[in-house]
Interface confidence: low
Amino acid sequence: DTHKSEIAHRFKDLGEEHFKGLVLIAFSQYLQQCPFDEHVKLVNELTEFAKTCVADESHAGCEKSLHTLFGDELCKVASLRETYGDMADCCEKQEPERNECFLSHKDDSPDLPKLKPDPNTLCDEFKADEKKFWGKYLYEIARRHPYFYAPELLYYANKYNGVFQECCQAEDKGACLLPKIETMREKVLASSARQRLRCASIQKFGERALKAWSVARLSQKFPKAEFVEVTKLVTDLTKVHKECCHGDLLECADDRADLAKYICDNQDTISSKLKECCDKPLLEKSHCIAEVEKDAIPENLPPLTADFAEDKDVCKNYQEAKDAFLGSFLYEYSRRHPEYAVSVLLRLAKEYEATLEECCAKDDPHACYSTVFDKLKHLVDEPQNLIKQNCDQFEKLGEYGFQNALIVRYTRKVPQVSTPTLVEVSRSLGKVGTRCCTKPESERMPCTEDYLSLILNRLCVLHEKTPVSEKVTKCCTESLVNRRPCFSALTPDETYVPKAFDEKLFTFHADICTLPDTEKQIKKQTALVELLKHKPKATEEQLKTVMENFVAFVDKCCAADDKEACFAVEGPKLVVSTQTALA
């Protein structure tokens, strides 16, 4: 399926709107600090060139690869060296090394201001130019989330414009907009984290890791589909994600559209739940398929033990085609257990593989592997017990209290990790309670385990940028599926040398009074992490006293007439009382 001009091919397949949107995303994900108008110029240049190639595929330059064309545009940016430093060195390389170089400079934590939605300003911008508004959303999200799944971002941008379409005509714009934007924000952040995990899986553990994850997920969603069908879907889906993670956004979006078409054309053999999705237009269709509920498990499925424990030929089957045999084990297990987390299903498959490796080398393999399902039981029990304990704690403490308990837990485990990262990760971990503990039993494990995988991947990604803890590196790199059990098993670090008490970190000003509640919480939680880094062995009682003193101090000064004076006088007293309480 070769084309004379790749750019013309993609432009024709995707249409101008999607082409422009995807190019804008690509540029924004690479050059995260460039202003919007700069990107628009680059996009327009490339779009005009694509149109030239559509009109005449043999036009000069039209035969170039997309990486070459994209890279040439990026390297034209005048301020490349001042703004991005050694990223400019990428431009001295040839493809494919140049693109690899650009990819390696993507920043997962760019220093960009928080987006604060102001309904009136946003509605004015929306009414002035809907197209520009749409593009600005793509740009702002893409530069903050350099691995965001591009075709899905187009979907969210349309939804976002839809919200403004509806709310900017409302009497109270804020009341209409803000809750909708917040709901969308949560979804967008989760979507970003999911794609970041997919890309990390491919980059750090190879595409086999993503394929295994997808086999489990799709088998749960489509339990009526045959193994061959699931394998085909997994192969196609892996290609889509590989392309998006590699910055090949036009190919990725095009292939994703083809996959959605294939799924809908073959829905009779895939799932009975797809009908509604398949009636939708492209972007909604693909999103809907990705989120579709799990189909009912077919009746009268034989017990798993028949093929994988009782059969005398298990070792023969395994040794003849290891990947296919383990794949079918994962498929059969997953389609029977929609209530298990994907990560748990992958641990089961890993343990099953290890058992076969051990047993098939013995004199009586069958006697060895026939009890394998009993051996696997603990892998299901462990997360179930952990979920029960943590949900009990969440119900007792509430989200904020649970976050603080996790801050204590994780700061003691890995005190070397930066304070902002510990706060961010612990806050996210605490939200698992709100998100998952309220769900019915059958949904708790997938919700918890798979959400934790996303958060721990964020920790791993941030830690990789500036590694400070061997324990974190070990948990992040040894095994993708065992990351969560690895972190759960960490104990307080006894080798850690406490930080000296830094008064600066406990100096506060009147600006804290006007902060939104969330920002206030983050300030308090930052102080809590710093306290623990100073006194890792502080008791719960000591920490409680210090935090209560801190809250009382903030409340008192924020109620004072001269707030700044109050902070100046009471702040040093707080430092003394804190040191005393921790002595």
């Epitope: 999607h18 809907e130 349309n158 972007l283």
Partner: nanobody, 126 residues
Framework: EVQLLESGGGLVQPGGSLRLSCAAS????????VAWFRQAPGKEREFVAG????????YYADSVKGRFTISRDNSKNTLYLQMNSLRPEDTAVYYC???????????????????WGQGTLVTVSS
């Protein structure tokens, strides 16, 4: 230049259904944002439902949400409005409107649509 021709209107009892069609010529229908508007006697023209150009995200007025469905068949270059559970207050002349240039989303503002059909009358009465 886009020409639009509506059909499918008529008299229907409350609770009944009708399907309106709007055939477009002069431009591909998937390259335009298209919408249905209606105008009851003595009232302003109001937005009913719309579908974006190229991206196909749909929008509905609150009064018809869950009862009406907008769709298009690109191969036939035709826009549809499936109207179920019709009520007397749905009585109006229904117009099809187009806004070329592949706008990403539809607009509820009638003035933004340069191309209009001549309308088809829908009467809901027992």
């Amino acid at each position: 230049e886009v020409q639009l021709l509506e059909s499918g209107g008529g008299l229907v009892q409350p609770g009944g259904s009708l399907r309106l069609s709007c055939a477009a010529s002069g431009r591909y229908i998937d390259e335009t944002a298209v919408a249905w508007f209606r105008q009851a006697p003595g009232k302003e023209r109001e937005f009913v439902a719309g579908i974006g150009g190229g991206v196909d995200i749909t929008y509905y007025a609150d009064s018809v949400k869950g009862r009406f469905t907008i769709s298009r068949d690109n191969s036939k270059n035709t826009l549809y409005l499936q109207m179920n559970s019709l009520r007397p207050e749905d009585t109006a002349v229904y117009y099809c409107a187009a806004r070329p240039g592949k706008p990403l989303i539809t607009s509820k503002v009638a003035d933004l649509y340069p191309y209009w059909g001549q309308g088809t009358l829908v009467t809901v009465s027992s």
